[in-house]
Interface confidence: low
């Protein structure tokens, strides 16, 4: 529907608040720097223009594309060249180039402080203070650090973290209140902007189709009882949503998903007997537990697949008439079966389902040629279920702090070229799929855990992809999004890899460890342990373990004496020694 | 712009029942949260109870539980407080409420529209 005025549409369909907080969210995923005033200011100005075109449709510039006025805000901006270098030449630019521009300068680890948590009182003083600008700030340091944050989902935890202030900034014991819904908003927060990472990487590296293709297997597993035209509906629909989002166009994607979970709310009836709750809520809160929702029950007396897409005569007609369509709806049949698969190993069921036919479609005796095709699945499907046994029995045996660090060898081990801190984050989120998901039965083991690392293993991707250091990383990154995960397990030990130089420095700890948090400490000691496969790709688990578990000792002791400094300092340059001597550096 | 308009209070003695209605007009009615606060002389308003758009959840105060009932009647564009066993420290100005976008239903500021007040007075 034609609006003369885009920005005056989306204020209206938005109100003000959602307007004001989707504005900022945009701003500070694109100009990730900027101080917070600087974008309170902006916000505001644009806020006042959009109350014109309110009252006026007609007022002057409010004909204008969301992308030009917001554009040109941005580069208002006095410090553009001197703090983004030559990002403010995408002021130069036209749109829709200007906003490209805006979106390939996007920095996924921009170099932001980390964010300290201030003491419980001086947070509840501040809240109480000036709740507006508590809020926005809140919005304003995670959507700088996490710049394809799903922004209508972060108005959700937005308000979630406005209701813990609320709450518990009253209670008697503050700190016991709020510190924990503070870190359960943080891992989810972290989780969430994985989960949206991956979808954005989907689209723009892989194409709409990818992402289509996605969608169609997870609804059809989400919703087994709706038809195939209700799910295209769905994927369309969500396409639409997340293209917003992914293209920084906040406000439509904002304004479409609200759209949408009203649609499948009036609809429910014909998607899914589980949305009842959901619906019941408030549109935030709904858009959230839909995404969310868990799969249907599966129709009673589905018939065979292979009557439709391996026995039937048509099966290469039907293809040839409408390619995508078919696969789909293969795709969609396989899914609403399968919740006990990945979403990824059914889009490699779907793909190699698909090289056969074009294979076979073309073949003297089509079906002869494609009558076996479902016996290759089996290979495909026995591939992650063997590897998520094997690894969910190590996981169990080690603990998760053992297992994230047999990780972190086994990767370092692949890919030494990677930057440290980048392996250490990476593999120790690869080790939570064991807490994540091997306490789960064995029906929901693999949809948790694969699709859990096909989006961490996109955050290594889109890490690397900064600065690229690893042609190996290249590779299984960018041939086939939902091959990623094999494609990494199958590499071995890089024997390219030339051993980095030994660096006392890099071995050598002061007493400040001694006060760091259990989680902080162990990301000490992983760093020490990349660093040591770096040094010594060769060496094996019992010399790595030996060495970790002297560094340990050496920790604790150190930390218990009454000059720890000293202690660090003299029982460090033992423990490297000893260490050297054990590796043979 | 909805509009609330409350009625039903009174005065009445302890023990004794009343029924307040709050009456909706402007906004499509089975779409809002519903809640009531009540505000007594010199005290902050405090929350009372609230209903969800299809009766499906609905919250109360734990000063009145199992003496009020909230209900809502989406033909009617009607919400109602039944309340029960009255004591004298109910005696307040009771406001209903209506939210489009709450989802913590015991927060004042979750609710974006206000009606008057209906005043209960619990005296012997």
């Known amino acids: 529907d034609a609006h003369k005025s885009e920005v005056a549409h989306r204020f209206k369909d938005l109100g003000e608040e959602n307007f004001k907080a989707l504005v900022l969210i945009a701003f500070a995923q694109y100009l990730q720097q900027c101080p917070f005033e600087d974008h309170v200011k902006l916000v505001n100005e644009v806020t006042e223009f959009a109350k014109t075109c309110v009252a006026d449709e007609s007022a002057e510039n409010c004909d204008k594309s969301l992308h030009t006025l917001f554009g040109d805000k941005l580069c208002t901006v006095a410090t553009l060249r001197e703090t983004y270098g030559e990002m403010a030449d995408c002021c130069a630019k036209q749109e829709p180039e200007r906003n490209e521009c805006f979106l390939q300068h996007k920095d996924d680890n921009p170099n932001l402080p980390r964010l300290v948590r201030p003491e419980v009182d001086v947070m509840c003083t501040a809240f109480h203070d000036n709740e507006e600008t508590f809020l926005k700030k809140y919005l304003y340091e995670i959507a700088r650090r996490h710049p394809y944050f799903y922004a209508p989902e972060l108005l959700f935890f937005a308000k979630r973290y406005k209701a813990a202030f609320t709450e518990c900034c009253q209670a008697a014991d503050k700190a016991a209140c709020l510190l924990p819904k503070l870190d359960e908003l943080r891992d989810e927060g972290k989780a969430s902007s994985a989960k949206q990472r991956l979808k954005c990487a989907s689209l723009q590296k892989f194409g709409e189709r990818a992402f289509k293709a996605w969608a169609v297997a997870r609804l059809s597993q989400r919703f087994p009882k709706a038809e195939f035209a209700e799910v295209s509906k769905l994927v369309t629909d969500l396409t639409k949503v997340h293209t917003e989002c992914c293209h920084g166009d906040l406000l439509e994607c904002a304004d479409d998903r609200a759209d949408l979970a009203k649609y499948i709310c009036e609809n429910q009836d014909s998607i899914s007997s589980k949305l009842k709750e959901c619906c019941e809520k408030p549109l935030l809160e709904k858009s959230h537990c839909i995404a969310e929702v868990e799969n249907d029950e599966m129709p009673a007396d589905l018939p065979s697949l292979a009557a439709d897409f391996v026995e039937s005569k048509d099966v290469c007609k039907n293809y040839a008439e409408a390619k995508d369509v078919f696969l789909g709806m293969f795709l969609y049949e396989y899914a609403r079966r399968h919740p006990d698969y990945s979403v990824v190993l059914l889009l490699r069921l779907a793909k190699t389902y698909e090289t056969t036919l074009e294979k076979c479609c073309a073949a003297a005796d089509p079906h002869e040629c494609y009558a076996k095709v479902f016996d290759e699945f089996k290979p495909l499907v026995e591939e992650p279920q063997n590897l998520i046994k094997q690894n969910c029995e190590l996981f169990e045996q080690l603990g998760e702090y053992k297992f994230q660090n047999a990780l972190l060898v086994r990767y370092t081990k692949k890919v030494p070229q990677v930057s440290t801190p980048t392996l250490v984050e990476v593999s120790r989120n690869l080790g939570k799929v064991g807490s994540k998901c091997c306490k789960h039965p064995e029906a929901k083991r693999m949809p948790c855990a694969e699709d859990y690392l096909s989006v961490v293993l996109n955050q290594l991707c889109v890490l690397h992809e900064k600065t690229p250091v690893s042609d190996r990383v290249t590779k299984c990154c960018t041939e086939s999004l939902v091959n990623r995960r094999p494609c990494f397990s199958a590499l071995e030990v890089d024997e390219t890899y030339v051993p980095k130089e030994f660096n006392a420095e890099t071995f050598t700890f002061h007493a400040d460890i001694c006060t760091l948090s259990e989680k902080e400490r162990q990301i000490k000691k992983q760093t020490a342990l990349v660093e040591l496969v770096k040094h010594k790709p060769k060496a094996t688990k019992e010399q790595l373990k030996a060495v970790m578990d002297d560094f340990a000792a050496f920790v604790e002791k150190c930390c218990k004496a009454d000059d720890k400094e000293t202690c660090f300092a003299e029982e460090g340059k033992k423990l490297v020694a000893a260490s050297q001597a054990a590796l043979g550096l | 712009e909805v509009q609330l308009v409350e009625s039903g209070g009174g005065v009445v003695q302890p023990g004794d029942s009343l029924r307040l209605s709050c009456a909706a007009s402007?906004?499509?009615?089975?779409?809002?949260?519903m809640g009531w606060f009540r505000q007594a002389p010199g005290k902050e308003r405090e929350f009372v109870s609230a209903?969800?758009?299809?009766?499906?959840?609905?919250y109360y105060a734990n000063s009145v539980k199992g003496r009020f009932t909230i209900s809502r009647d989406n033909s009617k564009n009607t919400v109602y407080l039944q309340l029960n066993s009255l004591r004298p420290e109910d005696t307040a100005l009771y406001y209903c409420a209506a939210s489009r976008f709450t989802s913590w239903y015991t927060a004042d500021y979750e609710y974006d529209y206000w009606g008057q007040g209906t005043l209960v007075t619990v005296s012997s």
């Open positions: 402007g906004g499509t009615f089975s779409t809002y949260v």
């Open positions: 209903i969800s758009q299809n009766s499906i959840h609905t």
